[in-house]
Interface confidence: low
């Protein structure tokens, strides 16, 4: 199709190489035409509509987006060429930086249900590099955390640097819709709610003799709860003595509750104690089976391939630590009465007896 | 293991203000947002509003003018004040606690309940 | 305040059958919607949250399907203890707001 008659608009990406960071385009179409994809109007940053189309409209209009390469090849669909370019809705989200995301990206409405509709398209002449490192020490993150229940400020990357006196006027997006009560370099939350996390979007215009640009830059913004003041408490098991069968196998699950802390270093492991002696056990890797706002469950498990006799005089002991402090649990294995037949106890009196020359030839100093 | 015990009054009177206490046994009330609900007799149940640990509300807009949820920490107690009461506000009042569970986006649960309080506006 | 229509109110089914219950939402909800049971006298209890996610102890005879305005509660093989009132609920714009409810009695 044509792309002569797109409106056209200009973007700059300036990625921090220090960090991570995303990027998004918007399809916004503009409203000469009497069509119903384009039903936005180019909106100046002091109007507010009344509803901006492709955001949580049931209608969603299907938009297709494409690249037009630098050396007038024919336009390339964004999804069969760039996988780490996602198309969702009417927004098109670059999941890594880097200079080759220079270019322009035109979108229109899959459906052309009129004349009118060929002329309905954006290109957005992007163009991506990297920030100096000597521009700004203390740039703000493209991932921000937000304190629930305290105050709280969400700054724009491009612009932390500056005073809010030396900023330019900024027009900021969450989750695609925009925000009209700020046009400040900081949104800043009286009161930090749930709701507030999200995608946000920081736009301000940059102009030379030739051309202006708006620069874009995006802030991934959760809602967290405070650092945890306790130490993790663990919640299996339970009881400090387990019944077992001799010469059988046996896993024993240990699970721990580790309140949220912005930086997690969770420690769990296992050790046994025998006598004067205590060791950390080889056991298989701590998963992760719960994990909410406010505190994550951990597991690991010790596993025996066959209980023996020394293993009811030794105890095992789970060992869980956090930033605040550390907890342990102790369990000592106790025969189950009546269990085993006698080809059951003899097998363990023969594991135990090779097991104690392993054992003894380690360690000297042993009782 | 937490448990919730919903306490007050079982009869008020129209044009006065009902009271309820929830007490929290067996966890902290930190780090938790706490929910009271409704349930007419025979019907369904309505979202009254939520308080944090912190002290912040949201309250049904079709309540609002009414409703005041407040929350002690040093007694592990949240309590729910409703004025004005008519005979429609006779009900089954639950507290529940609400988890945020986070997959990527935050998904909330109200997983734990108390067994309910009738309450019965009547002269 | 989004609505959420469940169907039917009431249906009868013998142990062992598969049961249905539909839930739909007046607006578009991703799936923050969550699936109680609630038996006479008691409190709900949550079986489902996120649409799909089992809450611990749930038998996987309960499964949750669904997302945008359209969910699904899903009981593979009715057990006696089954039988009950189950509500939806969504969690995704305040006021929270709950289904009016299925009640699933004996044949």
């Known amino acids: 199709f044509n792309i002569s008659g797109c409106s056209t608009k200009k973007l700059l990406w300036a990625y921090s190489t220090r960090s991570e960071e995303e990027f998004i385009l918007f399809c916004d179409l503009p409203e000469p035409q009497k069509s119903h994809f384009c039903h936005r109007s180019q909106l100046s940053p002091t109007q507010v509509p009344d509803h901006l189309p492709f955001t949580d409209s049931k209608d969603l209009p299907d938009v297709q987006w494409y690249r037009q390469p630098s050396n007038g090849d024919p336009l390339e669909d964004i999804r069969k060429s760039y996988p780490h370019i996602i198309q969702d809705k009417c927004t098109l989200r670059f999941l890594t930086p880097g200079v080759n995301n220079t270019g322009s990206y035109i979108c229109r409405p899959k459906m052309i249900k009129s004349p009118y509709d060929v002329a309905c398209c954006v290109k957005m002449i992007l163009e991506v590099k990297p920030q100096s490192n000597a521009s700004c020490e203390n740039s703000a993150s493209h991932k921000q955390d937000l304190l629930l229940g305290s105050t709280g400020s969400i700054s724009c990357p491009s612009l932390s640097c500056q005073s809010d006196a030396q900023s330019p006027e900024v027009t900021w997006y969450k989750n695609g819709k925009l925000l009209s009560m700020t046009r400040s370099n900081r949104i800043v939350v009286d009161e930090v709610y749930i709701y507030h996390q999200g995608t946000y979007v920081c736009d301000y215009t940059q102009s030379d003799t030739a051309s202006s640009w708006t620069v874009r830059a995006v802030v991934q913004v959760r809602t967290i709860v405070g650092d945890t003041k306790l130490k993790p408490d663990i919640l299996d098991p339970v009881e400090s003595t387990l019944e077992v069968e001799l010469g059988k196998p046996l896993t024993i699950s240990c699970k721990a509750r580790f309140g949220f802390e912005r930086v997690f270093n969770p420690v769990m492991k296992w050790y046994i104690k025998d006598a004067d002696l205590e060791w950390e056990v080889s056991v298989p890797e701590a998963k992760s089976i719960k994990s909410t706002l406010k505190d994550e469950i951990i597991e690991r498990n010790i596993i025996l391939e066959k209980v023996t006799q020394r293993d009811l005089r030794r105890t095992f002991v789970c060992f869980v630590q956090n930033s605040i402090g550390n907890t342990t649990q102790s369990v000592q294995l106790k025969e189950k009465r009546g269990s085993g037949g006698l080809n059951d106890i003899f097998e363990a009196q023969k594991i135990e007896w090779h097991e104690t020359v392993r054992f003894q030839s380690h360690h000297h100093h042993h009782h | 293991q937490v448990q919730l015990q919903e306490s007050g009054p079982g009869l008020v009177k129209p044009s006065e203000t009902l009271s309820l206490t929830c007490t929290v046994s067996g966890g902290s009330i930190s780090n938790y947002y706490w929910t009271w609900i409704r349930q007419p007799p025979g019907k369904g149940l309505e979202w009254i509003g939520y308080i944090s640990d912190s002290g912040s509300t949201n309250y049904n807009p079709s309540l609002k003018s009414r409703v005041t949820i407040s929350v002690d920490t040093s007694k592990n107690q949240f309590s729910l004040k409703l004025s004005s009461v008519t005979a429609a506000d006779t009900a089954v009042y639950y507290c529940?606690?609400?988890?945020?569970?986070?997959?990527?986006?935050?998904?909330?649960?109200?997983?734990?309940w108390g067994q309910g309080t009738t309450v019965t506006v009547s002269s | 305040a989004i609505q959420l229509t469940q169907s039917p109110s009431s249906l009868s089914a013998s142990v062992g059958d598969r049961v249905t219950i539909t839930c739909r939402a007046s607006?578009?909800?991703?799936?923050?919607l969550a699936w109680y049971q609630q038996k006479p006298g008691k409190a709900p209890k949550l079986l489902i949250y996120e649409a799909s996610n089992w809450e611990s102890g749930v038998p996987s005879r309960f499964s949750g399907s669904g997302s945008g305005t359209d969910f699904t509660l899903t009981i593979s093989s009715l057990q006696p203890e089954d039988f009950a009132t189950y509500y939806c609920q969504q969690f995704n714009s305040y006021p929270w707001t709950f289904g009016q409810g299925t009640k699933v009695e004996i044949k």
């Open positions: 607006q578009g909800i991703s799936s923050a």
């Open positions: 529940a606690r609400e988890t945020i569970v986070v997959r990527g986006f935050y998904f909330y649960v109200m997983d734990v």
